[in-house]
Interface confidence: low
């Protein structure tokens, strides 16, 4: 018996060939001997089967002795043995229809799990193998699960269902909803304007939801909500904003926040959360602000940084075009009785300057 695999929702064509290359009488029946379709001369006739409105044939092929059965919009329950009766002989074809669907939605938040469920006809024992866009293979039976989806899992998943040495392939487009970066750090001199950007790693036609930026200043004992906003069809509208600092927010995507000036009391880390409509859970992006200040008080030249700096960062004070006078893995360095000239305060990581502030020391007469 010939086995044909079909995909739910697709169209399948079951072939039936007579030895005579001409139009002769034929019938297609199901395993209950209920007539699906046949012919009377050059006319197509249909029987009382459940397939009635979804079954068809190709009259143009009858003259060549080919009498296909076409079933449109396949359903799992169409899985059956179909019998073609032609020239006093019977050809049997077993049709097995499979469906593969993603749990609830194909737009999933980063960190959520994807479950692919295989619908299969009773009595079948298929195996499934799926390949993710980043080349990861997963195997399973009726369900396949991938926990902790990552950004690289966005794209087309190709799944192969294997049954009776036959294969049928499904392609499922998965969109992982996430920010492009999990974390970012902004280095600013005191008084400079600060720009925070939160680009999304996906595009959808309609994007609606709401979000909030919580901020934990290094100097504060608890975190504080700096701004809450709504997102409607990619348009941003601010709901609430603190008076200090008074953030400004761009009206269009990508989400963009402006802090009028970097001050030591604002240095710290924030967590921007975005809850998308009809999605359980939220998108997160961490943002960090490091603020530098260089000051001269009487005979003391001081350079300080506030905010989340890594312990390997180096803070240095140097006179322009000279070797560093002081260089420490600390958050504050100073020089007593500095020489006159342009001093540079540098925050660097393995020799790469992240932040620089210049201060002019005048000669003392």
């Amino acid at each position: 018996k010939k086995v044909v695999l079909g995909k739910k929702g697709d169209t399948v064509e079951l072939t039936c060939t007579a030895s005579q290359k001409k139009s002769i009488q034929f019938h297609w029946k199901n395993s209950n001997q209920i007539k699906i379709l046949g012919n009377q001369g050059s006319f197509l006739t249909k029987g009382p089967s459940k397939l009635n409105d979804r079954a068809d044939s190709r009259r143009s092929l009858w003259d060549q002795g080919n009498f296909p059965l076409i079933i449109k919009n396949l359903k799992i329950e169409d899985s059956d043995t179909y019998i073609c009766e032609v020239e006093d002989q019977k050809e049997e074809v077993q049709l097995l229809v499979f469906g593969l669907t993603a749990n609830s939605d194909t737009h999933l938040l980063q960190g959520q799990s994807l479950t692919l469920t295989l619908e299969s006809p009773p009595g079948s024992s298929p195996s499934v193998q799926c390949r993710s866009p980043r080349g990861k293979n997963i195997q399973g039976g009726k369900t396949l699960s991938v926990s902790q989806l990552e950004l690289q899992d966005s794209g087309t998943w190709t799944c192969t269902v294997l049954q009776n040495q036959k294969k049928v392939e499904f392609k499922i487009d998965i969109v992982v909803l996430a920010f492009q970066k999990a974390s970012s750090i902004v280095y600013k001199k005191e008084g400079e304007q600060v720009e925070f950007s939160f680009p999304l790693a996906f595009t959808v036609e309609k994007l609606t939801g709401s979000g909030e930026l919580w901020w934990q200043a290094e100097r504060a004992s608890s975190s504080k909500s700096w701004i809450t906003f709504d997102l409607k069809n990619k348009e941003v509208s601010v709901k609430r904003v603190t008076q200090d600092p008074k953030l400004q927010m761009g009206k269009k995507l990508p989400l963009h926040l402006t802090l009028p000036q970097a001050l030591p009391q604002y240095a710290g880390s924030g967590n921007l959360t975005l809850a998308l409509e009809a999605k359980t859970g939220k998108l997160h992006q961490e943002v960090n602000l490091v603020v530098m200040r260089a000051t001269q008080l009487q005979k003391n030249l001081t350079c300080e940084v506030w905010g989340p700096t890594s312990p390997k960062l180096m803070l240095s004070l140097k006179l322009e075009n000279k070797e560093a006078k002081v260089s420490k893995r600390e958050k504050a360095v100073w020089v007593l009785n500095p020489e006159a000239g342009m001093w540079q305060c540098l925050l660097s990581d393995s020799g790469q300057v992240l932040l620089e502030s210049n201060i002019k020391v005048l000669p003392t007469w």
Partner: antibody, heavy 122, light 107 residues
């Protein structure tokens, strides 16, 4: 502080329609989602649907599809729920509940009205 | 449709007691469970959000636990003002569904 004030009790005949109102104070209705829930005598609470102003979407529970209409008058900050083709089993207390000023969860029902009793009897 | 089975339907407690009210979901709903308190003739009050988070302004003697299918509302050191009807709500999928409710009486 969001508050919801519902219209008074109604007595209706089978086959008629009823329109229950829910007036919002302390906040603008356009920023709130409005859910409608009912409780028949001796039965549990039943969610009927909600209006989500963020995209103008109304979702009705399948059981009430075709019989219920949820609307809003943003000028008066009043939400309405109309139920048609009333039958005796629609006798219940009808509640409006809002997502309040939740920053994210438009589906939260964090503020409730006191309910409107609707009696369907011939 | 997710069915919520709440138990007990009725319970009696003495001031100072600890009470547990259970709500079981017919399918996995993650932590998408809210709890409410309602007194006769009054509007329902939102007490627990996302299964375990106490709503601001609610006394800390109320707490919630659970994830997936089994959830519990816990009231420690019960007070006479806690006499009310308590119900759970799942907002994981449409239609949102409620538990049958628990009537708590204080002796």
């Amino acid at each position: 502080q969001v508050q919801l004030v519902q219209s008074g009790a109604e007595v209706k005949k089978p086959g008629a329609s009823v329109k229950v109102s829910c007036k919002v104070s302390g906040y603008t209705l356009t920023a709130l989602s409005m859910h409608w829930v009912r409780q028949a005598p001796g039965k549990g609470l039943e969610w009927m649907g909600y209006f989500n102003p963020r995209d103008g979407e109304t979702i009705y529970a399948q059981k009430f599809q075709g019989r219920v209409t949820m609307t809003e008058d943003t000028f008066t900050d009043t939400a309405y729920m109309e139920l048609s083709s009333l039958r005796s089993e629609d006798t219940a207390i009808y509640y409006c509940a809002t997502g309040g000023d939740s920053d994210y969860y438009y589906y939260y029902m964090d503020v409730w009205g006191k309910g409107t009793t609707v009696t369907v009897s011939s | 449709e997710t069915t919520l089975t709440q138990s007990p339907a009725f319970m009696s407690a003495t001031p100072g007691d600890k009470v547990n009210i259970s709500c079981k979901a017919s399918q996995d709903i993650d932590d998408d469970m809210n709890w409410y308190q309602q007194k006769p003739g009054e509007a329902a009050i939102f007490i627990i959000q996302e299964a375990t988070t106490l709503v601001p302004g609610i006394p800390p003697r109320f707490s919630g636990s659970g994830y997936g299918t089994d959830f519990t509302l816990i009231i420690n050191n019960i007070e006479s003002e806690d006499a009310a009807y308590y119900f759970c709500l799942q907002h994981d999928n449409f239609p949102y569904t409620f538990g049958q409710g628990t009537k708590l009486e204080i002796k």
